[in-house]
């Protein structure tokens, strides 16, 4: 069976440029090692935002310099992307790969449109 990945259609980043969403997957097998990748699609270009590999039951660990953080619970991954600006508005795709044991399975969500609005600068006070 194909692996289905679900994620919300739209998310609005908060005033600090942080957006969170849940990426949920229906696992066809009993994976012990899972890789989660967030991709950004702009026009027809796809770029990797961040990626993390984790062992089932353990915490999700992104690289220290990553703009993403996350937690995992069963077949759900709670993803948070920080430091977003208005120019980062776009479609963010969650990809899940069951890396081990074989067979390998891959699933791609339909994407979450993240809207980012830069905060208005505070007016000067006399």
């Amino acid at each position: 069976k194909a692996m289905h990945v679900a994620q919300p259609a739209v998310v609005l980043a908060n005033s600090r440029g942080t957006a969170s969403f849940v990426c949920e997957y229906a696992s066809p097998g009993k994976a012990t090692e899972v890789r989660v990748t967030v991709l950004r699609q702009a026009d027809s270009q796809v770029t990797e935002v961040c990626a993390a590999t984790y062992m089932m039951g353990n915490e999700l660990t992104f690289l220290d310099d990553s703009i993403c953080t996350g937690t995992s619970s069963g077949n759900q991954v709670n993803l948070t992307i920080q430091g977003l600006r208005a120019m980062d508005t776009g479609l963010y795709i969650c990809k899940v790969e069951l890396m081990y044991p074989p067979p390998y399975y891959m699933g791609i969500g339909n994407g979450t449109q993240i809207y980012v609005i830069d905060p208005e600068p505070c007016p000067d006070s006399d």
Epitope: K1, A2, M3, E48, E97, M99
Partner: antibody, heavy 120, light 108 residues
Framework: QVQLVESGGGVVQPGRSLRLSCAAS????????MHWVRQAPGKGLEWVAV????????YYADSVKGRFTISRDNSKNTLYLQMYSLRAEDTAVYYC?????????????WGQGTLVTVSS | EIVLTQSPGTLSLSPGDRATLSCRAS???????LAWYQQKPGQAPRLLIY???SRATGIPDRFSGSGSGTDFTLTISRLEPEDFAVYYC?????????SGPGTKVDIK
Amino acid sequence: QVQLVESGGGVVQPGRSLRLSCAASGFTFSSYGMHWVRQAPGKGLEWVAVIWYDGNNKYYADSVKGRFTISRDNSKNTLYLQMYSLRAEDTAVYYCARGGILAAGIFDYWGQGTLVTVSS
Amino acid sequence: EIVLTQSPGTLSLSPGDRATLSCRASQSGSSSYLAWYQQKPGQAPRLLIYGASSRATGIPDRFSGSGSGTDFTLTISRLEPEDFAVYYCQQYGTSPFTSGPGTKVDIK
């Protein structure tokens, strides 16, 4: 631009070994899954093996499992295929291919291929 | 493993004709995780379509893909001389990554 250049092919006797190399350039090698795909003369495409980003996970086609070993050296941007106990049916053009960023099982760039002939 | 069947084996057409190539999966495990490749004699394959319907970079819009589940189609709206080649479908949703036997599009 993305470039993949295979080398190491040639004529080898049944039961012998051969190592293929694939030199990659034009992209961040360590961020991509890499594959070997082969094509026997006049036949279709057969996926052989994949090695994931960090080199920890490797999968093989049943036809080569236990005889072929895929590996990578991210510091040298090079992919390898060590082939042992070669058989006549392993005769093929061997291509190295990059896995796509959207899905690692998509072969988005290919090398020109290297011919392996197993014959006595 | 997922077995892919392509039909017809050979398609004899003229430049300007419309080509319709079929690919059927033995199970729906491929979902929309299906790609199409073009291969010309003496050359490596080239990615045309991924995700059943998305064109790869630089692929002309006369190439289009459709389908989901087990039945997929590659359509070439108007054949150009350079389009006469062998076309392979491939599923990438699960290992092993399997390909169809190919459809040869040749000049009538």
